[in-house]
Interface confidence: low
């Protein structure tokens, strides 16, 4: 698998992951012990026809053109988790792996 | 998980599943063998904020709102592989389970 | 405890080869980001590369070559092969852990080894 | 690749002041930033991580910002125990392979 990595001086116009950092601190996420920020990443950009396409399925789609179909966007296509310690609604500490917490590649789907 | 199911009279603007079935014949893809013609499913709709998102990252994302981030867009969150025989392009007949050929579940990622 | 312990460092003739080991207590190996960071006498450290979560490998662009790095999940040991030695990689070499994912932050090492010094010398 | 410039090369201050050590990179790299502390004779030990985060155990007396290329590590009240060698260390690229430190700025105490 394949997918293209940007910054903020990319000139690149397709799908490609950008980081960011989340910060939950500056969101007011009071519940969340740690971390208090990470880096999460996201995807944007433009899916030409069969660029970074992930799935034969989106292909398809494309060929047969049915009502509303948008075509493909770029959007996350690995993730992985993070661990994270935070306080639930009964105000108990949990320590968990909470998944997708980070864009590891970009494509359009 | 959860996710709309919908067909082509409905009303429903938001992120859906619309029933597709895909005909390799009418596309001319005469090197697949078997099956002539399938059920693909596609997604399209609207992706209003938090509706369907699968993942947590997606939130945080609109929150941090960074530059060229384009919003969720409504794309397949469980797919399905089916059985297939072809040509390759040896000319060698192959069976295989082609993976995300069927889209299951659509969701705002 | 938690701890990583070098060993296999000691004096090597120019050309020559050495292999470090890295001996992980405490935790799961292959759970965490292991990279190999040094420190010539009285500088400042210098990065060589890691072994990620998945085995891939990565290095510096001077070490790429000439060093490579390896585990043993078995006997939960990282382990970096040094070839062609010079007398520039005269160091003290540091096992280092990635940080836990908190904050996915492959190379912030927030465990250390005590660190084996290697010269190259004839 | 990065290029990480610190300064100054040696700082020397009594206990109780505020010091400022400034880490420059020779591009953007957003707040992928941390700053170790090495003692002589020992391994460096992570103070701060993603630019501000403070690392587990370490006093709240250090303080990370910055962003982008100018990152600073301040010290509010200058304790003796604090004498030592500060680095900071960043990755090079998006994909988080590849590492840059800086040269390293020593505190003294006076």
């Known amino acids: 698998d394949f997918g293209l990595d940007c910054d903020e001086h990319s000139t690149e116009s397709r799908c490609c992951r950008y980081p960011l950092t989340v910060d939950f601190e500056a969101f007011g996420w009071d519940w969340i012990i740690a971390p208090k920020r990470y880096k999460a990443n996201y995807c944007s950009g433009e899916c030409e026809f069969v660029f970074l396409q992930k799935y034969p399925h989106t292909h398809l789609v494309h060929q047969a053109n049915p009502r509303g179909s948008a075509g493909p966007c770029c959007t996350p296509t690995k993730m992985s988790p993070i661990n994270m310690l935070y306080f639930n609604g009964k105000e108990q500490i949990i320590y968990g792996k909470i998944p997708a917490m980070v864009v590891d590649r970009c494509g359009c789907s | 998980d959860f996710g709309l199911d919908c067909d082509e009279h409905s009303t429903e603007s938001r992120c859906c599943r619309y029933p597709l079935t895909v005909d390799f014949e009418a596309f001319g893809w005469d090197w697949i063998i078997a099956p002539k013609r399938y059920k693909a499913n596609y997604c399209s709709g609207e992706c209003e904020f938090v509706f369907l998102q699968k993942y947590p990252h997606t939130h945080l994302v609109h929150q941090a709102n960074p530059r060229g981030s384009a919003g969720p867009c409504c794309t397949p969150t469980k797919m399905s592989p089916i059985n297939m025989l072809y040509f390759n392009g040896k000319e060698q007949i192959i069976y295989g389970k082609i993976p995300a050929m069927v889209v299951d579940r659509c969701g705002c990622s | 405890e938690v701890q990583l312990v070098e060993s296999g460092g000691g004096l090597v003739q120019p050309g020559g080869s050495l292999r470090l080991s890295c001996a992980v207590s405490?935790?799961?190996?292959?759970?965490?980001?292991k990279g190999w960071v040094r420190q010539a006498p009285g500088k400042g450290l210098e990065w060589i590369g890691i072994i990620n979560i998945e085995g891939s490998t990565y290095y510096a662009s001077w070490a790429e070559g000439r060093f490579t790095i390896s585990r043993d999940n078995s006997k939960n040991t990282v382990y970096l092969q040094m070839n062609s030695l010079r007398a520039e990689d005269t160091a003290v070499y540091f096992c280092?852990?990635?940080?836990?994912?908190?904050?996915?932050?492959?190379?912030?090492?927030?465990?250390w080894g005590q660190g084996t010094l290697v010269t190259v010398s004839s | 690749a990065v290029v990480m410039t610190q300064s100054p090369a040696t700082l020397s201050l009594s206990p109780g002041e505020r010091v400022t050590l400034s880490c420059q990179a020779s591009?953007?790299?957003?707040?992928?930033l941390s700053w170790y502390q090495q003692k002589p004779g020992q391994p460096p030990k992570l103070l701060i991580y993603l630019a501000s985060t403070l690392a587990s155990g370490v006093p709240s007396r250090f303080k990370g910002s910055g962003s982008g290329t100018d990152f600073t590590l301040t010290i509010s009240s200058l304790q003796p125990e604090d004498a030592a060698t500060y680095y900071c260390?960043?990755?090079?690229?998006?994909?988080?392979?590849?590492?840059?430190f800086g040269q390293g700025t020593k505190v003294e105490i006076k």
């Open positions: 591009q953007s790299i957003h707040h992928d």
């Open positions: 280092a852990r990635g940080h836990d994912n908190f904050g996915y932050s492959y190379h912030d090492f927030n465990l």
């Open positions: 405490g935790f799961t190996l292959s759970h965490y980001v």
């Open positions: 260390q960043t990755y090079d690229g998006i994909s988080h392979y590849g590492v840059a």
